[in-house]
């Protein structure tokens, strides 16, 4: 868990965590922006979606993403058995039937069309590093977060609790 010796300490537990219900406990339609207020946008190009991080013009409409929140039981780190608590996992869908996926081999974030039940690569553990910011950690690769790299979304490894507050993995959600 964070705040102890580092991110890796809870790797096994995160892999073993299970979604407790097949339906989300809540859903939230919001625009996604970076800590520095750049917008996350989605563009259909050659029958596939591309994800961009960019400054929007003054009156340009922000793209919305449907965040679906799921509860996940978290096995205990302390005893190695039993349930230690619950996590919130989210899936992010900017358009019908498309979800953000973690491509751990390429360290990339991609949009894939898929049917439910969604694969583990589409689930991200939700974090609040700040009161008004969120971060998204890969369910399939603990310690790896969605982040911003070269004006694109990428997967970024975070190796200590101090680095959890680095701006490039912090995002803001807004209804407007």
């Amino acid at each position: 868990a964070f705040g102890i010796s580092g991110v890796q300490k809870y790797t096994r537990a995160l892999h073993d965590s299970s979604i407790t219900g097949i339906s989300p406990i809540t859903e939230y339609l919001a625009s996604l922006s970076t800590y520095n207020d750049q917008s996350i946008t989605f563009a259909l190009e050659d029958e596939s979606y591309e994800i961009y991080v960019e400054d929007l013009k003054k009156d340009e409409k922000k793209d919305k993403v449907l965040l679906s929140y799921y509860e996940s039981q978290h096995p205990s780190n302390e005893s190695g058995d039993g349930v230690d608590g619950k996590m919130l996992m989210v899936t992010l869908s900017p358009t019908k039937d498309f979800w953000l996926h973690a491509n751990n081999k390429e360290h990339s974030v991609e949009l894939h069309k898929c049917e439910k039940p969604l694969p583990d690569q589409a689930f991200f553990v939700l974090h609040n590093m700040h009161s008004n910011c969120v971060s998204f950690e890969c369910k399939t690769d603990p310690g790896v977060f969605i982040g911003v790299k070269d004006n694109h979304l990428a997967l970024i490894k975070v190796d200590s609790s101090e680095n959890l507050c680095t701006e490039n993995i912090l995002f803001k959600l807004s209804e407007t």
Partner: antibody, heavy 121, light 106 residues
Framework: EVQLVESGGGLVQPGGSLRLSCAAS????????MYWVRQAPGKGLEWVAA????????YYPESVKGRFTISRDNAKNSLYLQMNSLRAEDTAVYYC??????????????WGQGTLVTVSS | DIQMTQSPSSLSASVGDRVTITCRAS??????LDWYQQKPGKAPKLLIY???NLQEGVPSRFSGSGSGTDFTLTISSLQPEDFATYYC????????FGGGTKVEIK
């Protein structure tokens, strides 16, 4: 079993200071947002302070900002509330509470039994 | 800061009654809202989270609804152990409680 046990309450004069403690057990303390909530005698609940799992950020309402400081020691599974420049209106039962989920600020899933702070001359 | 206004501040009801408590936020909070129950001399207990989800162990006679600024806690058939004070709580922007609703025996 999740347990939160507050201590440190008592009688203090106006302008004085007090430090409350909350001993946590039964869960991975370093992974949760933690809170202090108070309740004046015969009144409602008031959120007083919040702190992130790694203690990187802390938050307060205007009523206590600049006078109260929340902190935590993850190695000791302990939460603290340092209260300075105390006023009569700070008289209340102070509860320690834990977030419902790992890493997120949503919901106060577990509460301690509370400790009474009385500010009076 | 977001203000939470609860109504009524108190109500009298009988066992078996359907009870409704409302909470209004000063600005939209989506469904980032909980309901808590508190009995005299005891710590509050989480009943409903994210507006409508029942906390484990809470009887199904409790339900929550609403989104945006207006929320409702309903007790479908009041039981003797339900006489208590109920609070709403938002965590969309900062954190704040409603003033509470005391449910008393008629």
């Amino acid at each position: 079993e999740v347990q939160l046990v507050e201590s440190g309450g008592g009688l203090v004069q106006p302008g004085g200071s007090l430090r409350l403690s909350c001993a946590a057990s039964g869960f991975t303390f370093s992974s949760y947002w933690m809170y202090w909530v108070r309740q004046a005698p015969g009144k409602g609940l008031e959120w007083v302070a919040a702190i992130t799992p790694n203690a990187g950020e802390d938050y307060y309402p205007e009523s206590v900002k600049g006078r109260f400081t929340i902190s935590r020691d993850n190695a000791k599974n302990s939460l603290y509330l340092q209260m300075n420049s105390l006023r009569a209106e700070d008289t209340a039962v102070y509860y320690c509470a834990r977030g419902q989920y790992y890493y997120t600020k949503y919901s106060l899933g577990y509460w301690g039994q509370g400790t009474l702070v009385t500010v009076s001359s | 800061d977001i203000q939470m206004t609860q109504s009524p501040s108190s109500l009298s009801a009988s066992v078996g009654d359907r009870v409704t408590i409302t909470c209004r936020a000063s600005q939209p909070i989506h469904n980032h809202l909980d309901w808590y129950q508190q009995k005299p001399g005891k710590a509050p207990k989480l009943l409903i989270y994210f507006g409508k989800n029942l906390q484990e162990g809470v009887p199904s006679r409790f339900s929550g609804s609403g989104s945006g600024t207006d929320f409702t806690l309903t007790i479908s058939s009041l039981q003797p152990e339900d006489f208590a004070t109920y609070y709403c709580f938002q965590y969309k922007k900062g954190w704040s409680f409603g003033g509470g609703t005391k449910v008393e025996i008629k």
